[in-house]
Each structure stands twice: as C-alpha cells, then as structure tokens.
Amino acid sequence: TQNKALPENVKYGIVLDAGSSHTSLYIYKWPAEKENDTGVVHQVEECRVKGPGISKFVQKVNEIGIYLTDCMERAREVIPRSQHQETPVYLGATAGMRLLRMESEELADRVLDVVERSLSNYPFDFQGARIITGQEEGAYGWITINYLLGKFSQKTRWFSIVPYETNNQETFGALDLGGASTQVTFVPQNQTIESPDNALQFRLYGKDYNVYTHSFLCYGKDQALWQKLAKDIQVASNEILRDPCFHPGYKKVVNVSDLYKTPCTKRFEKKLPFDQFRIQGTGDYEQCHQSILELFNTSYCPYSQCAFNGIFLPPLQGDFGAFSAFYFVMKFLNLTSEKVSQEKVTEMMKKFCAQPWEEIKTSYAGVKEKYLSEYCFSGTYILSLLLQGYHFTADSWEHIHFIGKIQGSDAGWTLGYMLNLTNMIPAEQPLSTPLSHSTYV
C-alpha cells in the first residue's frame, strides 16, 4: 500500500484589505505548534480583487458578492478543504470607507452589511468586516514590518537574509501611503510624545515600546490629487487648468461634481461657472512641488515640532520602511535602490515629469493610461510629503528603505492585524527558545 503523507500541522488565516482604490486578499500560513514564535507566519498568496474599492459600490451594493467571488474562490483552492472551517477571515476597510462614513454612517453600514453577508457564505470562519482606525492602520503596519524583519525576537533570525543593513534590534519606522490616507509610525528616541492621540504603548515579546503614530486622512495619493485640483481650479481664470503635475501634452476632462464628491475637497469648494474643466499638462516638477506644498499647512504648530496641519511629529529616528504606494510608485519610477540619493531622485523626477505625454505612452505601452498619467504627480507628492511633510533631509533619506515584500510577505497592515486578532503576538517572551528559521521552513 502507498504511504500517505502525514497532514501538515499548519494553520491559515485570511485578511482582506479593503482600500480606497481596490481590495486585496492575503492568505497567511504558520506552523500550528509555533504560534507564539516570532517570524513564523508568512504570506502564501495575494489576490487582487478586480475593480475599485468597496466604497465605490455604495449605489450598486448588489454587485459586491460577485466582486469578491474570484479571490474568495482562490482562497478555497489554496487552503486545504479540511481546514476551511477553522480558517479565520477578517476584512479591514481603511480610509476610503472612513471617508464614506464621514459622509453617511448609514451608507457605510449598508456597504459593510452586504460585504459581511457575502463573505459569510464561504466555508471559512468569518470574523466580520470593520473600518479600522488610522491609528490601527499605522500600528499594524509597524508591527508587520518589524515582525517580518525579526525585530521582536531576542536574537534576530533574519540577520543573514534581510537585505537591509540595520542597527541590530532597533525597530524600523513604518511609512505607509494609500490612496486616501498616509501613516507614519516609529519609536522616537527619548522623546515624550506630546500629543496623547499619537501615542501607543505596546509590550511585545517581553519588551515595552512607546510608539508614535499618525494617519493623515485625505493625504493618500489619490485624495491629495483631488485636493490639489480643487485648490488650483479655485483660482483658474477659465475652465482650462494648466497643471504642472501632468506631462506636457496630456489632456483630461474632469467633472466638477466628481471633484467635490469627496469630503477631502470640501475646504476648497467654490461655486464654479462651469460643470467641467480641462487639465492641460505642463510637466514642471518645481511648480508641481510648490503646488503640492500648499496642501500642507505649516503655519500653525501647538507643539515643539509638527509635521503639518498642526499635527505633532517627534524628531525622526532610525531606519524606515516605506511601503504600499510609496513602494509601488517609486518602483515604477525605478527609484527604490538604496544607492539613489534624494538629490538624484529629485533630478530623475524633474526629467520624468518633463517628458511629453505621447513619449511616455509609447515608452510604457502596457500601463493603463489612468495610472500612467498620475506617476508624475505621485512621485512629486511622495518627495514633498517625505521632505517637507515629515522633515526627512538629504541625509536621513538614506534611512528610507522602499519595501514591497519582506521574506515573501507584503509590507502593510494586514499581517499585523491578523497577528493581533489571532493573539499570536504575546506580551511576554515565550519560554521555549524559537528554533532557527531553517528548521521549520
């Protein structure tokens, strides 16, 4: 008779990241007997849901079930059937849904109700859908990258395989950029966190961490662009907006109703004498940069130091992992290398933005024009946010590591969220010494 392989003693977990621009499903796997060890959970699958973020379904909620089907069916295939019922599924919605909730609590609940009903029909252990706070988003992103970098273990097991020259057990700060919000999270050095709203205390694996975090709602790359357009159209002399953040020769028609749909543009709302306006790209990095800086109010700070809009920010400390759209945009622009200085990044951005739109379209024929057209803005916005918003300098720029994945797992809040909800990060160091990584991979 044929020998039957013993079933793997592993567990699985699913987290759906319901972002402002799209939803992604992540499947995690870990050895069942090592739940409390550091660094044992890893991502086995990412499935990007086709379509926009869930907040866009507010007028067509009956389509949500179909929207989620492909990725949920993928999860059914990846996870052994015998483990479906014990696999938890969590859905966390971020700033896109925070904005919808600001407009209407009922509309947000309507979307989440249908999301929950749809997900509960799958054979997994569905644990609900919720809008996570900006503070949670920042904190879980910080936990994810430090967990994956081995920063919480007594003796880092990743030292030989993590491609970052890091200062031993000092944690990395986390910089997360989404479509509708951006988060900055790090452990400041011997600095009191002057604003209680920005202070988090964790005890992880026997060590205390005093963490600073802030989420800037409306300062994700997509909402920042809407803000900039709303600000600039206020002072336009007619319905043609010459925009330095788009390539020369680029043209696009924008509906004023779309511009004012989001709560993020309310402060710039003005009765305009037209229903549409036309963007004409001029491709000028410096002017684009200056226009973006007008979104950051730096004239008021009730603390010793602020980022912008009167939000406390302690002096930057240590290395930072910049992920999500920070990574995707910089990767597209080929600017993620550790060797590229801030000056070089600025120089490359100037060249990129100045390239004619027709030339850009030819060079990147496989990229959707909607996305392609916005890289000049997004790249300039990232520089503006990091340098003027968060006060990175040419020197401290070298401490920013643009990270997509760490050991095959995406950097982002989802892993930290799952580790927390499944109680897999103990407050105290487990008694047994974790095996070396090679023992169980």
Epitope: V61, N62, I64, G65, E106, D109, R110, L112, D113, V114, E116, R117, S118, S120, F126, Q127, G128
Partner: antibody
C-alpha cells in the same frame, strides 16, 4: 406597526421540497433583513439564513448551504424560504423574523406566527 | 461560529421573586446581544437588544447587563405571565446564533 404573516402548515414526503412564504405589512419591507429561524419540536431556535429584500442578497448558515434558498419579492412585500431534499429531521416550526435594527443590526424585532412543516413518509 | 451557552437550563422561581439568567459567548460579541421570551405555541418575542436596552412595550422589571462574553437577564419580580423559555442571541457575526434556552418555571 409591522406584521409578518406566514403561509399555512405543510406535510411533505422525504426528498421533496417545501416553500414557505412570509408577507410583511404596515412598514418598510425592502431595507430590513428578513431572517428565517426554525425550531424542532421541544428544541431551541436555529438560524437558517437571511435576505435584504432591497438588494436580493441572501446568506445562509453553513449547515443549510445548498439546500435552502431564500428569496424576496419587493412588489408584494413577501419573503420566501425554500428547503429541498427534506428529511424527517427537518420537521419543525419555521419562523420568519424581521431584522429591525437596520443595516448591520440583526436583532429580530418582529416575528411571523410560524409555519409547521412535517416531513413524513 | 460563535457558540452561545445559557445557564441554568431550568430555573424554578416563586412569583414575586427575582430571576437571574446567564448567557456566555465563546468569543466577544461586544454589546450585540439580544434576549427573547417564548411561551408555548407562540413565536419568540424580543425583550432586550444591545445587551441592555428594552424593546418597546417591555416592562421595566426586565433588565439586561453585560458585554463581551458574559451577559445576564434579570427579571426583578416574576409575574405569572413571565414563566416561559428565554433565549439569548448574538448578532455581531454571521451565522446568528442562539443559546439553548433557559426555562423559567413556577416553583
């Protein structure tokens, strides 16, 4: 004041199907979920599934997946529960109940009078 | 799924006395908990929702308390019409789940 009126008692053969109706009157039908709950003789309450008539979206307890279908007709303010491949263990009183708290609030505030379904050969 | 456990299964109380019924959830349900009363041959009736809010028309002698995993229904002074079966139900997550019930009978 919302009222739910269910169809009459049914006697069915094993292997057949039953379809129970639940007509709402005196309030908004579409926006609130309608749940179906059954109770076997001398037993407790068991949730089977739910639908939001406004969207036609139904969800079901894993135990009944593939065997139960819940639908709603907004024009007549009526919800339906069809259970197929009946067996003797399905003998129970079937209740419809309105989820009276709005979206994401699934407390069951208004109940139908119940429909006795007997499965016997 | 969330398992709801009620205790005791049967509670014998004299009219006018206080009755305390317990309900435990296998994981936190916050305050998403309801209590129902069911009399023989009748449909259940909602008494309490949100763990502690009385449904309309429910007498003040019925009160609910608790949050997370431990909940209590208290009937301060039992009337003859209160002898019935009481069920708790969580509505935080699908599937909606009920406790096994507590039968309150005349002592």
């Amino acid at each position: 004041q919302v009222q739910l009126v269910q169809s009459g008692a049914e006697v069915k053969k094993p292997g057949s199907s039953v379809k129970v109706s639940c007509k709402a009157s005196g309030g908004t039908f579409s926006k609130y979920g309608i749940s179906w709950v059954r109770q076997a003789p001398g037993q407790g309450l068991e949730w089977m599934g739910s639908i939001i008539p406004e969207f036609g979206i139904a969800n079901y307890a894993q135990k009944f997946q593939g065997r139960v279908t819940i639908t709603a007709d907004e024009s007549t303010s009526t919800a339906y529960m069809e259970l197929s491949s009946l067996r003797s263990e399905d003998t129970a009183v079937y209740y419809c109940a309105r989820e009276s708290g709005g979206y994401r609030d699934h407390r069951l505030g208004v109940w139908g009078q119940g429909t006795m379904v007997t499965v016997s050969s | 799924e969330i398992v709801m456990t009620q205790s005791p299964a049967t509670l014998s109380v004299s009219p006018g006395e206080r009755a305390t019924l317990s309900c435990r959830a296998s994981q936190s349900v916050g305050s998403n908990l309801a209590w129902y009363q069911q009399k023989p041959g009748q449909a259940p009736r909602l008494l309490i929702y949100g763990a502690s809010t009385r449904a309309s028309g429910i007498p003040a002698r019925f009160s609910g308390s608790g949050s997370g995993t431990e909940f209590t229904l208290t009937i301060s002074s039992l009337q003859s019409e209160d002898f019935a079966v009481y069920y708790c139900q969580q509505y935080l997550l699908w599937p909606l789940t009920f406790g096994g019930g507590t039968k309150v009978e005349i002592k």
